[in-house]
Interface confidence: medium
Amino acid sequence: FAPVPRLTWEHGEVGLVQFHKPGIFNYSALLMSEDKDTLYVGAREAVFAVNALNISEKQHEVYWKVSEDKKSKCAEKGKSKQTECLNYIRVLQPLSSTSLYVCGTNAFQPTCDHLNLTSFKFLGKSEDGKGRCPFDPAHSYTSVMVGGELYSGTSYNFLGSEPIISRNSSHSPLRTEYAIPWLNEPSFVFADVIQKSPDGPEGEDDKVYFFFTEVSVEYEFVFKLMIPRVARVCKGDQGGLRTLQKKWTSFLKARLICSKPDSGLVFNILQDVFVLRAPGLKEPVFYAVFTPQLNNVGLSAVCAYTLATVEAVFSRGKYMQSATVEQSHTKWVRYNGPVPTPRPGACIDSEARAANYTSSLNLPDKTLQFVKDHPLMDDSVTPIDNRPKLIKKDVNYTQIVVDRTQALDGTFYDVMFISTDRGALHKAVILTKEVHVIEETQLFRDSEPVLTLLLSSKKGRKFVYAGSNSGVVQAPLAFCEKHGSCEDCVLARDPYCAWSPAIKACVTLHQEEASSRGWIQDMSGDTSSCLDKSKESFNQHFFKHGGTAELKCFQKSNLARVVWKFQNGELKAASPKYGFVGRKHLLIFNLSDGDSGVYQCLSEERVRNKTVSQLLAKHVLEVK
């Protein structure tokens, strides 16, 4: 299990910027316009545009309220007029440089509209949002805009019992088959498009990936066994001519594995997914947050998957088929029979075109019937190194974003920012042999779940934005200036931070104007380069005989041990003479002449089998 975060920052301790509008709740849709330096925020009955550099500066706002009549009709159907029968913004996607595509639950009558970014007004199109946006604000949803067409995963009816993955397109709308083998009570988490590789074969197609958790179709237990999935469809899919008419011909899904090797610890509830794309990466990497199905202990894990592994399962894996096996928990088994050509579920690529299959509309019925009956792959998608990147106890992770950053020595590190259901943000760096949890920041004053996380990693301007029920918070990727000494700065093992001996401060890397000459950073936590010992200061105290002295010591690191020394001997709390307050401050009881002298508070921190010792405070005590 991962260690506790080395540092804990309380809400008021660090520089966080907040945005919220009184009376507005559920800030759950965030969209960044990097070129405009604007963050768009979708909340309940409102959309805002705020300055991405300082989100407390609101630029525009527009309200989209539900009429009293609609509210009443919704309430008649047994829904809450005060909460459920409102308009929760669920889709906030870019349509063009001057407009956004916005959908809301609209009192259980999902509706979509175009938001003009110049006037910041809705165009009043009121398109039916069925299949694009959930009816119920409590139901899961995901969407991505690809080439002006909305790809969504949500529920298609009032009850939320008909799941759908669809493409809203004027010329070629497509959807999933309403059948349990395709989607079985899914909880949608994430969707994104992966563009064809520029080095890949000619005629490849872009693919849209959907991530969700669903009830297992392949196993049957006493309880509903949940299984995390990745599904994919091809952008060029146009449906079938007869079989699978107006349905996906390229819909395939596979199980995601995230488990601790050689233990029974299986993480099968998917919470969030982030696609890491970076110049140094050969291919995108999917980072995913999971919790176990029976999570009475508060466990969370992060697993990472390469695009190649996901693609391999869909392009070369075996299929599953429905089986009727008596006295067996297995309902689906591996299909070993002949597979039609072209391969079922494959995108129309140059190979297919060479065989005269120029579109999914002229695929043979055999291929279409096969994919209709076998949407589930037998092979599972396994994580990088066959194990989670991180397993954390006593926490329920909700969202994740990942930044790839270059340390002072030129090494690239993946830094994960993972939010919790109690309003905190954990920051963890993936090192060669371990994951180091750098810090935990309490983003929201109240312990409320983080609903959405967004990373803006524009050069020279990097922030994490978090949305919750009460508002949005903007946090920098590092709080380097909070590390007061060279040792603290290096022990943080934060790739964004380095110590500048010239200005005797911990500074943030990659600030355009700064020269990093002579800066000190060591991702193994080696502080031996920290030579500039700051001038020792001491606190002088005078106490009366028989009294009690309290000597203060402030230690931030949760991984360090505080040691008090008097005349070079370590003081133990076990003796009746001494006590500790909060494992840091020292109490000396029944003072006498022999207690006069120099008391030193040191922190001892184990890093890579070495103990780093730092003097935190020096107290000179005189008993009169």
Epitope: S263, A312, V313, R316, G317, K318, M320, M377, S380, T382
Partner: antibody, heavy 122, light 110 residues
Framework: QVQLQESGAGLLKPSETLSLTCAVY????????WSWIRQPPGKGLEWIGE???????NYNPSLKSRVTISVDTSKNQFSLKLSSVTAADTAVYYC????????????????WGQGTLVTVSS | QPVLTQPPSASGAPGQTVTISCSGG????????VNWYQQLPGTAPKLLIY???LLASGVSDRFSGSKSGTSASLAISGLQAEEEADYYC???????????FGGGTKLTVL
């Protein structure tokens, strides 16, 4: 870290029964298939058969009539019996874990024992 | 006789690229994925490539795998002396309902 260790008689006479056991340390036993693979001196690898924690087996058709693989989940062990041995059965015998994700095509031998040499000689 | 066919030997000078082929049939390489193993003298085999072309954990990216139809191949670029070993391909065979190996290729670094 998972470790596999083979044990059993190293020298046999023709027509005897070869008997080997593989002990699995440091890992979960269920969820995997466990294989026996052999390698005659100076030759290539030959798969003998596999078993999972519940006793389900698959055998190499060419050896099927002489092979029995069994499992003891309480001890995290699995065993190989090869009857009526001849000099052609002289080989280094390896046990290995077959990792199955899904049911088969996504599979591989990810952990191996160090191997034990079995010699058949009169 | 091994079900999968590999050349018995291959060689290359340090720094060169060497390719080892593995030929099978429809019931094994054609429909199932191929794994490659390296066996250094006197040791047990070690997994190099799985699922046709995915690199096993801790293996140098100078090793790469590929597959087309019923043939697979292993390529080693920037050859190093310590890579002198036997290399085996393996796949599941649907007809035999079992694992099949190639006969192995002895790689010599000149």
């Amino acid at each position: 870290q998972v470790q596999l260790q083979e044990s059993g008689a190293g020298l046999l006479k023709p027509s005897e029964t070869l008997s080997l056991t593989c002990a699995v340390y440091g890992g979960s036993f269920s969820g995997y298939y466990w294989s026996w693979i052999r390698q005659p001196p100076g030759k290539g690898l030959e798969w003998i058969g596999e078993i999972n924690h519940s006793g389900s087996t698959n055998y190499n058709p060419s050896l099927k009539s002489r092979v029995t693989i069994s499992v003891d989940t309480s001890k995290n062990q699995f065993s190989l019996k090869l009857s009526s041995v001849t000099a052609a059965d002289t080989a280094v015998y390896y046990c290995a874990r077959t990792r199955y994700y899904g049911s088969g095509s996504w599979s591989l031998f990810d952990y191996w024992g160090q191997g034990t040499l079995v010699t058949v000689s009169s | 006789q091994p079900v999968l066919t590999q050349p018995p030997s291959a060689s290359g000078a340090p720094g060169q690229t060497v390719t080892i082929s593995c030929s099978g049939g429809n019931s094994n390489v054609g429909t199932n994925t191929v794994n490659w193993y390296q066996q250094l003298p006197g040791t047990a085999p070690k997994l190099l490539i799985y699922y046709d072309d995915l690199l096993a954990s801790g293996v140098s990216d100078r090793f790469s795998g590929s597959k087309s139809g019923t043939s697979a191949s292993l390529a080693i670029s920037g050859l190093q002396a310590e890579e002198e070993a036997d290399y085996y391909c393996a796949a599941w065979d649907d007809t035999l309902n079992g694992w099949v190996f190639g006969g192995g290729t002895k790689l010599t670094v000149l």
